[in-house]
Interface confidence: medium
């Protein structure tokens, strides 16, 4: 699996997208969890309706809200009021009984927000350094890392 | 096996400059945060710079903002730290280490090299 | 910044005996909170992440607990080859790191 890397500013509302072939995984729920560490475990945040025919409504847990388009086949995560801590490696799962399978891995970044002057003497700032390639702006800035970049290990 | 090798500290007069280069093998260097972090006897440790994987964003403590500049070569797999207007409160062992992914300038570091001396001292 | 205090700063026990390392911070760090081992002339290895999670390649008789202010380092039975110097670190804030905590045998 490549790596996406999202980014999103301080305080403001980050939206990831994880696309899946949705014949392949029909009937499947969904989950997005938190790799906490190299070997360590994905920590489920906040995974779809346990009616996969309800998987289009949104569930919260906490500030992070997941939404799934079992017909079009696009799982859609929401961070709300982003924190330095949401930073991080995340995954895109699809649920099989115990099992889960990689939809997408996520490396969500967070830049500082330009007008929250509170640590600004050593915050980075969008704009001080280049851009990505191929980016493209909606909610957030994604774009893909190359195939092999920041490897996830096996989900326990 | 994760290494990280530093090189470049010595003994250095006030106000000068001085480079510390990092050399990381044993994993790929360009997906991951790097980061120094500092220890002297007075006060302790301390995060000194970051830098991220993707955008290369650079994060600095108060202190050194301004006169010292973290920055990497994936090509080369080694990280850098050019101290500049060097004081004798930078005296320390600087280490190259190796972060976990969040936050702005440190999650925890996972890995770390065996440190090299910076002293600071006319 | 948030000042992380680790007491004792000088710990001495015995071999077997099951050792106790407190770290607090000046205000809630939630679990963003890091153990690391020192030994001397070495650097700092990675010990435990967020609060309770072993690093790979460490024993299990360590083990990390708590959650907001208080945490605490626990060595169930001491070994010859974890005497060294203790810090915690939080990461919820900014970073900053504890004074240590140095153990040695009785």
């Known amino acids: 699996h490549n790596t996406t890397v999202f980014q999103g500013v301080a305080g403001q509302s980050l939206q990831v997208s994880c696309p899946y072939d949705s014949m392949k995984h029909w009937g499947r729920r969904k989950a997005w969890c938190r790799q906490l560490g190299e070997k360590g475990p994905c920590q489920r945040v906040v995974s779809t309706h346990n009616l996969w025919l309800l998987s289009f409504l949104r569930r919260w847990n906490g500030s992070t809200a997941i939404t799934d388009d079992t017909l079009g086949g696009t799982l859609t995560i929401t961070l709300r009021n982003l924190q330095p801590h949401d930073a991080g490696l995340y995954q895109c799962q699809s649920l099989h009984g115990s099992e889960a399978d990689t939809l997408r891995k996520v490396l969500v970044e967070v830049l500082a927000d330009p007008l929250d002057h509170r640590d600004a003497g050593d915050l980075w700032f969008p704009g001080e350094s280049e851009s990505f390639e191929d980016a493209h702006v909606e909610h957030s800035i994604s774009r893909s890392l190359l195939e092999g970049e920041i490897p996830f290990p096996p989900t326990s | 096996e994760v290494q990280l090798v530093e090189s470049g500290g010595g003994l250095v007069q006030p106000g000068r400059s001085m480079m510390l280069s990092c050399s990381a093998s044993?994993?790929?260097?360009?997906?991951?945060?790097m980061a120094w972090v500092r220890q002297a006897p007075t006060t302790g440790l301390e995060w000194v710079a970051s830098?991220?994987?993707?955008?290369?964003?650079?994060y600095y403590r108060h202190s050194v903002k301004g006169r010292f500049t973290i920055s990497r070569d994936n090509a080369k797999s080694t990280l850098y730290l050019q101290m500049d207007s060097l004081r004798s409160e930078d005296t320390a062992s600087y280490y190259c280490?190796?972060?976990?992914?969040?936050?702005?300038?440190?999650?925890?570091?996972?890995?770390w090299g065996q440190g090299v001396m910076v002293t600071v001292s006319s | 910044d948030i000042q992380m205090t680790q007491s004792p700063s000088l710990l001495s026990a015995s071999v077997g005996d099951r050792v106790t390392l407190s770290c607090k911070a000046g205000?809630?760090?939630?679990?963003?909170l890091a153990w690391y081992q020192q030994k001397l002339g070495e650097a700092p290895k990675l010990l435990i992440y967020?609060?309770?999670i072993l690093q790979t390649g460490f024993p299990s008789r360590f083990s990390g607990t708590g959650s907001g202010t208080d945490f605490t380092l626990t060595i169930s039975s001491l070994q010859p080859e974890d005497v060294a110097t203790y810090f915690c670190?939080?990461?919820?804030?900014?970073?900053?790191f504890g004074g240590g905590t140095k153990l040695e045998l009785k």
């Open positions: 670190q939080q990461y919820n804030s900014w970073t900053t």
């Open positions: 967020n609060a309770n």
């Open positions: 205000q809630n760090v939630n679990n963003y």
């Open positions: 830098i991220t994987t993707g955008s290369g964003n650079t």
């Open positions: 280490a190796r972060r976990w992914y969040g936050g702005y300038e440190g999650y925890y570091f996972d890995y």
């Open positions: 044993g994993f790929t260097f360009s997906n991951y945060h």
